[in-house]
Interface confidence: low
């Protein structure tokens, strides 16, 4: 999906009002210095691409983020403020079999959410030069 035509200010507002708090809640009990933020993005569409990947793509060491509160709110924000985004997600959602879920929080998930926090911060400051 091409995030170029999203309403970035509305997504930023959604992040500041709720998503950021949910990310902090998920990371509660973790020192802010525990993980280095290495995942980067160069502009707002790129940031949203990376945010989508880390939030919704299944990973080998962390497989449970898509059902977290911050992930569901991220999905809602993208669906509302990115034209055509929800259509691109329908097939993927329908393809998933309905099974009983169990919540698993692993260290790899904590690292991944730490990276997500960095990507969101970068998304909110698009004019900053890359370090």
């Amino acid at each position: 999906y091409d995030f170029t035509n999203c309403d970035f200010e509305k997504i930023k507002a959604a992040y500041l009002s709720t998503i950021s708090k949910d990310l902090i809640t998920y990371m509660s009990g973790t020192k802010s210095t525990e993980f280095n933020n290495t995942v980067s993005c160069s502009n707002r569409p790129h940031c949203l691409t990376e945010i989508q990947s880390l939030t919704f793509n299944p990973t080998a060491g962390c497989a449970s983020l898509a059902k977290e509160m911050f992930a569901m709110k991220t999905k809602a924000a993208l669906a509302i403020w990115c034209p055509g985004y929800s259509e691109t997600q329908i097939n993927a959602t329908q393809a998933m079999k309905k099974r009983r879920k169990r919540k698993v929080t692993t260290n790899k998930c904590l690292e991944q959410v730490s990276q997500l926090q960095g990507l969101w911060r970068r998304f909110n400051r698009p004019l900053l030069k890359q370090q």
Epitope: N36, N57, G61, V104
Partner: antibody
Amino acid sequence: EVQLVESGGGLVQPGGSLRLSCAASGFTFSNYDMTWVRQAPGKGLEWVSSITFASSYIYYADSVKGRFTISRDNAKNSLSLQMNSLRAEDTAVYYCTRGGGAYYGGSLDVWGQGVLVTVSS
Amino acid sequence: DIVMTQTPLSLSVTPGEPASISCRSSQSLLHSNEYTYLHWYLQKPGQSPQLLIYLVSHRASGVPDRFSGSGSDTDFTLKISRVEAEDVGVYYCEQTLQTPFTFGGGTKVEIK
């Protein structure tokens, strides 16, 4: 073009050391987990080690644990594998690969050309 | 460790004919997130392996649609609808549900 280029292979005596390097280009290296896979002559593929994008988590195959060390330098787009106490059974082509955890369910979607390590006296 | 078993060991196929490779895991590769962590690779003669299929059935970028993956839990299949000369090589399945990640022993596909 997305590319991984390995270097540092060669002939080494049993008990010796070798350091493999992998130079990444064409993608944002720091956004991906990286993995080393090896293939002994005429044999199949064997997973060796993986490192997460921020180096927070590192995994090794039992066969190399305590002898091999994986590391990365995101500023230089490089991955390394320090191999100590080498044995004859470590003789293989070593592949640097992208993946092992971050995207596409951990599948390895980019592979280097491989570098041959021969352990022999 | 999860053991991956591939059959057959080798396969000789006439161009244009279909081919099928089986991969069986010693335990289910289905995670509670509903994804199944099984991937397929092809190693052509003298080349590095390349990703064909990820997460059971998703074709990697640039992979022809004659390749398809299917299966669930512990039993998986890679199908080539019409084998072409360029499809020769060794096919491997891999699980990334848990470390150590493990590969199948490989299936060598030749052209008759």
